[in-house]
């Protein structure tokens, strides 16, 4: 009876995600067969989040919209470890929007999920950010410094990275 109600709950949760994520990849968390964590196929997973590299070229606003219709946001990078994971899936000759912007052009950077912007956990390329008209952040590769962040005009189409919390069923 307990197993039955658990299964019914799982099925209703899966139905919620079905519109945009017809297929989920789930792994068993820990030793308990009851707990599964899932990411949409073919998203990748790291710690408690799922990541998707969007290869369509869009402005920052539309990139965020694209993530939101999939139940995600543009990526918020919280640690060096998280960035190191993300860059494994990126192409060196491309740039990708992050969920970081400076809407007023006053160098008040803010993350899309309202995570406080912490200057100590940022990975700007040297000399960046450098232009008040460039109010959106990308991650890209520079041969001298490897992967880092750069500010760019928000209307210039780029690829992007979406992030969502893992789905627990």
């Amino acid at each position: 009876n307990f197993m039955y109600s658990k299964t019914v709950k799982r099925l209703s949760k899966l139905r919620e995600y079905q519109q945009y994520h017809p297929s989920l990849t789930c792994v068993m968390e820990g030793k308990d067969i009851e707990d599964w964590s899932c990411c949409p196929t073919p998203w990748t997973s790291f710690q408690s989040s799922c990541y998707f590299i969007s290869t369509g070229m869009q402005s920052w606003t539309k990139s965020q919209k694209n993530c939101s219709v999939m139940g995600a946001d543009l990526v918020v990078i919280n640690t060096r470890e998280e960035q190191d994971f993300i860059i494994q899936n990126l192409k060196r000759n491309s740039s990708y929007f992050l969920g970081l912007s400076d809407p007023g052009g006053r160098r008040h950077w803010q993350w899309v999920d309202q995570t406080p912007y912490n200057e100590n956990v940022t990975f700007w390329h040297s000399g960046e950010p450098n232009n008040l008209d460039e109010r959106c952040a990308i991650i890209n590769f520079r041969s001298s410094e490897e992967w880092g962040w750069n500010d760019i005009h928000c209307h210039v189409p780029q690829k992007s990275i979406c992030k969502m919390k893992k789905i627990y069923i």
């Epitope: 369509g56 539309k62 219709v69 760019i152 005009h153 209307h155 189409p157």
Partner: antibody
Framework: QVQLVQSGAEVKKPGASVKVSCKAS????????IHWVRQAPGQGLEWMGT????????SYNQKFKGRVTMTRDTSTSTVYMELSSLRSEDTAVYYC???????????WGQGTLVTVSS | DIQMTQSPSSLSASVGDRVTITCRAS??????LAWYQQKPGKAPKLLLY???TLAIGVPSRFSGSGSGTDYTLTISSLQPEDFATYYC?????????FGGGTKVEIK
């Protein structure tokens, strides 16, 4: 007032290159991105790509990749679109257009007719 | 790439007529759609953006509607200066493709 003034008509031979200019005035040149759109005689409109005059960042329509190059000169508030390896199908009016704050083309140049003929 | 299919390709109408032009996208463009008017030998002029927002200086007889993949431009009462070619364009992702155009001619 905002103005985009383009260079004059050009006649080119197949295989040659053409460079069309678009001089902006009436606004801060480096604050708005510029797009290029072309229109073959009696045909519809075709998006070619965009350039950000501040940093020089570009994004091109894959159809033209390798043949189109967009550049800018901030000292003269001018954007350039160069198309190489011209063929007769490239005969068209080439327009530059400014993308406004709302992310649509709010101002257009008057157009530059490029004729490719042997 | 998202394709834009505009219909009809041409239509004949009289002054005072109500005119409707449709544009269908091959994928969801989330209302990121513009409508332009173009007269012979001139550059296109922005009429509406975000599917239904009137551009500055555009008469209120022009209106737009739609969502997802299907969008409409309506001219409530056609005026002599409205005889022109109309284009839709999406701005969801590059390439920002245009519809094939609708030529509005005098009946």
């Amino acid at each position: 007032q905002v103005q985009l003034v383009q260079s004059g008509a050009e006649v080119k031979k197949p295989g040659a290159s053409v460079k069309v200019s678009c001089k902006a005035s009436g606004y801060t040149f480096t604050s708005y991105i510029i797009h290029w759109v072309r229109q073959a005689p009696g045909q519809g409109l075709e998006w070619m790509g965009t350039i950000y005059p501040g940093g020089g960042d570009t994004s091109y329509n894959q159809k033209f990749k390798g043949r189109v190059t967009m550049t800018r000169d901030t000292s003269t508030s001018t954007v350039y679109m160069e198309l190489s390896s011209l063929r007769s199908e490239d005969t068209a009016v080439y327009y530059c257009a400014r993308m406004g704050d709302n992310e649509y083309f709010d101002y257009w140049g008057q157009g530059t007719l490029v004729t490719v003929s042997s | 790439d998202i394709q834009m299919t505009q219909s009809p390709s041409s239509l004949s109408a009289s002054v005072g007529d109500r005119v409707t032009i449709t544009c269908r996208a091959s994928g969801n463009i989330h209302n990121y759609l513009a409508w332009y008017q173009q007269k012979p030998g001139k550059a296109p002029k922005l009429l509406l953006y975000d599917a239904e927002t009137l551009a500055i200086g555009v008469p209120s007889r022009f209106s737009g509607s739609g969502s997802g993949t299907d969008y409409t431009l309506t001219i409530s009462s056609l005026q002599p200066e409205d005889f022109a070619t109309y284009y839709c364009q999406h701005f969801w992702s590059t390439p920002y493709t245009f519809g094939g155009g609708t030529k509005v001619e005098i009946k």
